[in-house]
């Protein structure tokens, strides 16, 4: 189990410290009132190119 | 066989302390968030409080939070809630519950309930 | 704060009989609705979670539906030892749950 502070989530999921654990951001899109939503907000879940013309 | 044993309850003196226990035996503690609930004589049933299973997140209901404190010891396989400054109407049934095991999203098991009576 | 609103408070109903049970919330919470059954004395017991999924060693004559703001507990067939009181719980906002004032369901 990974503890706060150490290597971060893997793409497109993010701590819960209520759950103590990596949670999926898609979850998010149902349920945004938990704690781990936060954190998914500030990365993008997953990568994007800008593409110009 | 999971159970869970809750102690502690009693008669209290308005603005007086108890401290409850929930044993917990048959499963793994440590990996599960638990919470307390109670339950007023004759009426429904009452989040009080919940803490992740490290116990380094807590949350509480605004009827207890500054008076009541929820804790717990994962070597000990025990969940605690210390309550102070006790008033009348925290007279009650106070169970202690597991939340699953993926979210929690449900409470599968539950203690019997210990009894607190708030009363002069 | 979402608020859980369950429809009857109370019922009469006999053995064998098919027993309806309302749940609103306050607002949309989704599938997040579990369902508990509670007798004199005793602890609350989880049946239905998730809206529609039976909890392990749940008889199947219990069952449960409905999504957004309205849900139904349905008993297929009222056995004796069914008369209890039901509550609804929403964990849409978990960890900060409520429940419904329940449903108390007695023998006619």
């Known amino acids: 189990e990974q503890a706060p502070g150490t290597a971060p989530c893997s793409r497109g999921s993010s701590w819960s410290a209520d759950l103590d654990k990596c949670m999926d951001c898609a979850s998010c899109r149902a349920r945004p009132h938990s704690d781990f939503c936060l954190g998914c907000a500030a990365a993008p879940p997953a990568p994007f190119r800008l593409l110009w013309p | 066989e999971v159970q869970l044993l809750e102690s502690g309850g009693g008669l209290v003196q308005p603005g007086g302390s108890l401290r409850l226990s929930c044993a917990a035996s048959?499963?793994?503690?440590?990996?599960?968030?638990m919470i307390w609930v109670r339950q007023a004589p004759g009426k429904g049933l009452e989040w009080v409080s919940y803490?992740?299973?490290?116990?380094?997140?807590?949350h509480y209901a605004d009827s207890v939070k500054g008076r009541f404190t929820i804790s717990r010891d994962n070597s000990k396989n025990t969940l605690y809630l210390q309550m102070n400054s006790l008033r009348a109407e925290d007279t009650a049934v106070y169970y202690c519950?597991?939340?699953?095991?993926?979210?929690?999203?449900?409470?599968?098991?539950w203690g019997q309930g210990t009894l607190v009576t708030v009363s002069s | 704060d979402i608020q859980m609103t369950q429809s009857p408070s109370s019922l009469s109903a006999s053995v064998g009989d098919r027993v309806t049970i309302t749940c609103r919330a306050s607002?949309?919470?989704?599938?997040?609705l579990n369902w508990y059954q509670q007798k004199p004395g005793k602890a609350p017991k989880l049946l239905i979670y998730?809206?529609?999924s039976l909890q392990s060693g749940v008889p199947s004559r219990f069952s449960g539906s409905g999504s957004g703001t309205d849900f139904t507990l349905t008993i297929s067939s009222l056995q004796p030892e069914d008369f209890a009181t039901y509550y609804c719980?929403?964990?849409?906002?978990?960890?900060?749950?409520?429940f419904g004032q329940g449903t108390k369901v007695e023998i006619k």
């Open positions: 607002q949309s919470i989704s599938g997040y």
């Open positions: 048959g499963f793994t503690f440590s990996p599960y968030p």
């Open positions: 803490i992740s299973p490290s116990g380094g997140s807590t």
């Open positions: 719980q929403q964990s849409y906002t978990s960890p900060f749950i409520t």
């Open positions: 998730q809206a529609s």
């Open positions: 519950a597991r939340g699953g095991d993926t979210y929690f999203d449900y409470f599968d098991y």
